[in-house]
Interface confidence: low
């Protein structure tokens, strides 16, 4: 489903919208992007509070979500191949819209190391507890979902839209209704700040159609960093109410005339702006003319001002805004240089880590180092990367190619490798024979043994005692492994080409097989056989199990 309900909070120079709907992180980002935003950042406690407020609005509208845990995507992600960095607050994750590593974090729990697949972050709301302001949503990390499966428990997402500035909400001096339409296609009648380029429709009157007047305004940039509606005087004024309705729509003082008309005024130290409603301080610095972290410095006699920038920044051509000095132009790093506000930092490519001689140097990460290897079996470190390999009898498996899966030789593409019984084992296989037949020295064929239909001769074994109930093995049968009395796997073999007549049932006492010539005199019980519907992963044979094993020495029928 798409994104449904939405809520809006605008504060500072950004608006946050919350949407409900089960989408993958990519679909959610795309939705935000279509309207000119990104999945929201949560770079500080203050921003976390803004995001929580917009989620609060959404939850109010949704009335009561039934999930105990609700998750909402935010714009924090880690690309495939980028490993966890426990030393950083963001743990190696980065914000979708770019920007520096930020100090604030609110992780739900310790993160597990994994570099294999892309990971995304959502805000976790525990709806079994009351959602209180002092309890900010935790960050939960997990798979990013896909269009078919957006991610378990994902209820929605939060977008962020940034603007040059905001207009104050329009103040009505009499009955009426304001409807704001924002550049990100949201309509609202109550915004605490209205983003630049928003439209406002004002319908004056108390719902009586004859009396209704309509006004249309646009939030424009009147001067650098000064945003207003271009309206003049309070809206929807009515002699019937004078200053009694919403203080006449005035920012500070409202002065009534005898005829029901009124004017807005300002307190000492403030002046009335061109909209004839809003008051601003007479101190030139009080309107915060300096932007981008610049400090406003009053000139002599408090008449004018200059803007001053912090270290690592310089004033732009407007002399009002600070712009970052790009230290990366001097190439101070060995691999990657990231210019940050007021400074820079060196980064290493995926597969490298900071280290080595010199400032900003990088060295290869040994992914195969002890305790660090992502591979199930063999691991080869390469410059900036690594690759996994498997021992003979196994092939690489898993979506990331780090796992090893046993090759089942008993159902190999070339057909059965054994003349009679075939036993698949972890990383290998071996052949066996039906009662009355013995395994030939080549470990593959069966030759007629003594006339007795008992087990092939060999060293006596504890397990022979009292085990005379045979199991019927029909031609070419496969069966699931059964567990012996001690919990050891008892293998029922795959039967390939029994040399006995096919219509005669074959009764077998518990199987004992002689090991082929590669390992004379080793007696083992088959640990795992091939099963067409094997349940669960196959286990390697335990040291005390008794299976006739093949050597990996290149002989026929062996690996």
């Amino acid at each position: 489903t798409g994104a449904d309900t939405e809520a809006v909070v605008c504060v500072g120079t950004a608006c946050y919208t919350a949407h409900s709907g089960k989408l993958s992180a990519a679909e959610a980002q795309n939705h935000c992007n279509q309207n000119g935003g990104n999945l929201a950042t949560v770079k500080s406690k203050e921003e976390a509070q803004h995001v929580q407020r917009v989620l609060a609005q959404l939850l109010r509208r949704e009335a009561a979500l039934t999930a105990r845990m609700s998750k909402f995507w935010i714009g924090l992600q880690r690309e495939k191949g980028k490993c966890l960095d426990p030393s950083l607050p963001l743990k190696g994750f980065s914000w979708v819209g770019g920007g520096e590593d930020t100090p604030y974090s609110n992780w739900h729990k310790e993160l597990r190391n994994s570099c294999i697949s892309k990971r995304c972050v959502s805000l976790l709301l525990d709806l079994s507890q009351p959602l209180l302001p002092s309890r900010l949503p935790k960050w939960s990390e997990g798979p990013c979902g896909s269009p078919g499966s957006p991610g378990s428990n994902i209820e929605g997402f939060v977008c962020k839209f940034s603007f040059k500035g905001m207009c104050r909400p329009l103040a009505l001096g009499g009955p009426g209704q304001v409807t704001y339409t924002t550049p990100f296609q949201t309509t609202s009648s109550s915004l605490e700040a209205v983003p630049f380029a928003s439209a406002a429709n004002v319908a004056c009157g108390e719902g009586d159609k004859d009396e209704t007047q309509s006004h249309y305004f646009l939030c424009k940039e009147k001067a650098p960093d000064v945003f207003d509606w271009g309206s003049s005087g309070p809206l929807c004024v009515s002699p019937k109410y004078g200053c009694n309705f919403n203080n006449g729509g005035c920012h500070q003082d409202c002065f009534e005339g005898g005829d029901g008309s009124f004017l807005c005024g300002c307190r000492p130290g403030f002046r009335l702006l061109d909209d004839l409603v809003t008051c601003a301080s007479r101190n030139p610095c009080s309107s915060s003319p300096c932007r981008g972290g610049a400090t406003c410095v009053l000139g002599p006699h408090g008449k004018n001002y200059t803007c001053r920038c912090p270290q690592g920044y310089q004033l732009d051509s407007s002399q009002l805004d600070c712009v970052d000095v790009d230290e990366c132009q001097d190439s101070p790093c060995a691999q990657e240089c990231v210019n940050t506000p007021g400074g820079f930092r060196c980064e290493c490519w995926v597969g490298y880590e900071p280290g080595g001689p010199g400032e900003g140097a990088c060295q290869d990460v040994d992914e195969c180092a002890l305790g660090r290897s992502p591979c199930a079996q063999g691991c080869t470190n390469t410059d900036g990367s690594f690759h996994c390999s498997c021992e003979e009898g196994y092939v690489l498996a898993g979506e990331d190619g780090t796992q090893c899966q046993d090759v089942d030789e008993c159902v190999g593409p070339g057909g059965p490798l054994c003349d009679s019984l075939c036993f698949n084992t972890q990383g290998s296989f071996h052949c066996g024979c039906l009662p009355g037949w013995v395994l030939a020295p080549n470990g593959v064929s069966c030759t007629m043994g003594p006339v007795s239909l008992g087990p092939p001769s060999g060293p006596p074994d504890e397990e022979d005692k009292g085990e005379k109930e045979g199991s019927t093995v029909p031609r070419a049968a496969t069966a699931s492994p059964t567990r012996g009395p001690e919990g050891t796997p008892k293998a029922t073999p795959t039967t390939s080409r029994p040399s006995l007549s096919s219509d005669a049932p074959i009764t077998s006492a518990p199987l004992k097989m002689l090991a082929p010539s590669g390992s004379p005199g080793v007696w083992r019980e088959p640990s795992i056989h091939h099963a067409t519907a094997a349940s669960g992963p196959q286990e390697p044979a335990g040291g005390d199990s008794s299976v006739a094993t093949q050597n990996n020495d290149g002989t026929d029928g062996q690996k």
Epitope: R60, P130, P133
Partner: antibody, heavy 120, light 111 residues
């Protein structure tokens, strides 16, 4: 109109339990949390906990944890508060009150109260 | 727990005069620009009634002689012109943190 109607007065012995009910009407029962607040004779107000009638989630004041149980019956739009191991200190008027789902959870509608007297 | 302290404990004011009740929280009850502080009125034998929420917002149906102000830890409830029906106990309450806590109450009487 919006109303919360509580069950009648109760007299209990120390060590016993009491179960007070609060029936809601005039609004969507599942869209508001329901709280329980008590007031001992001549004393102030004390918040005991709350229940989300939608999913039956509860959240209790630690002071009452283990002794208080809040439940709800969606079909009859009724919430219940059971307090166990009563002592004379639990003699009070018990109020149910509703609050918005999230944010400033002020109590905009209150029940008339149920007087519980614990006496041997 | 956040402790809410009301002052005075009781207040006697002449009809038509201003009554002012203070409420102090042991820590800030502000969050994201809002104060999570509410005022209730309780008359004898009745449940409390919401007067003001979020420090200064008048609940619908409450006379506008009641007003609230303050932020952070210090809050005030003002009755601009006391009427006979305003005789009651007034409680402040914070909803910023668990457990939700109330002040001890201020009894308003007519002088």
């Amino acid at each position: 109109q919006v109303q919360l109607v509580q069950s009648g007065a109760e007299v209990k012995k120390p060590g016993a339990s009491v179960k007070v009910s609060c029936k809601a009407s005039g609004y969507t029962f599942t869209s508001y949390w329901m709280h329980w607040v008590r007031q001992a004779p001549g004393q102030g107000l004390e918040w005991m906990g709350e229940i989300d009638p939608s999913a039956s989630y509860t959240y209790y004041n630690q002071k009452f944890k283990g002794r208080v149980t809040m439940t709800r019956d969606k079909s009859s739009s009724t919430v219940y508060m059971e307090l166990s191991s009563l002592t004379s200190e639990d003699s009070a008027v018990y109020y149910c009150a509703r609050s918005v789902y999230y944010g400033n959870k002020y109590f905009d509608v209150w029940g008339a109260g149920t007087t519980v007297t614990v006496s041997s | 727990d956040i402790v809410m302290t009301q002052s005075p404990d009781s207040l006697a004011v002449s009809l038509g005069e201003r009554a002012t009740i203070n409420c102090k929280a042991s820590q800030s009850v502000d969050y994201a620009g809002d104060s999570y502080l509410n005022w209730y009125q309780q008359k004898p034998g009745q449940p409390p009634k919401l007067l003001i929420y979020a420090a200064s917002n008048l609940e619908s149906g409450v006379p506008d002689r009641f007003s609230g102000s303050g932020s952070g830890t210090d809050f005030t409830l003002t009755i601009s012109s006391l009427q006979a029906e305003d005789v009651a106990v007034y409680y402040c309450q914070q909803t910023n943190e668990d457990p939700r806590t109330f002040g001890g109450g201020t009894k308003v009487e007519i002088k």
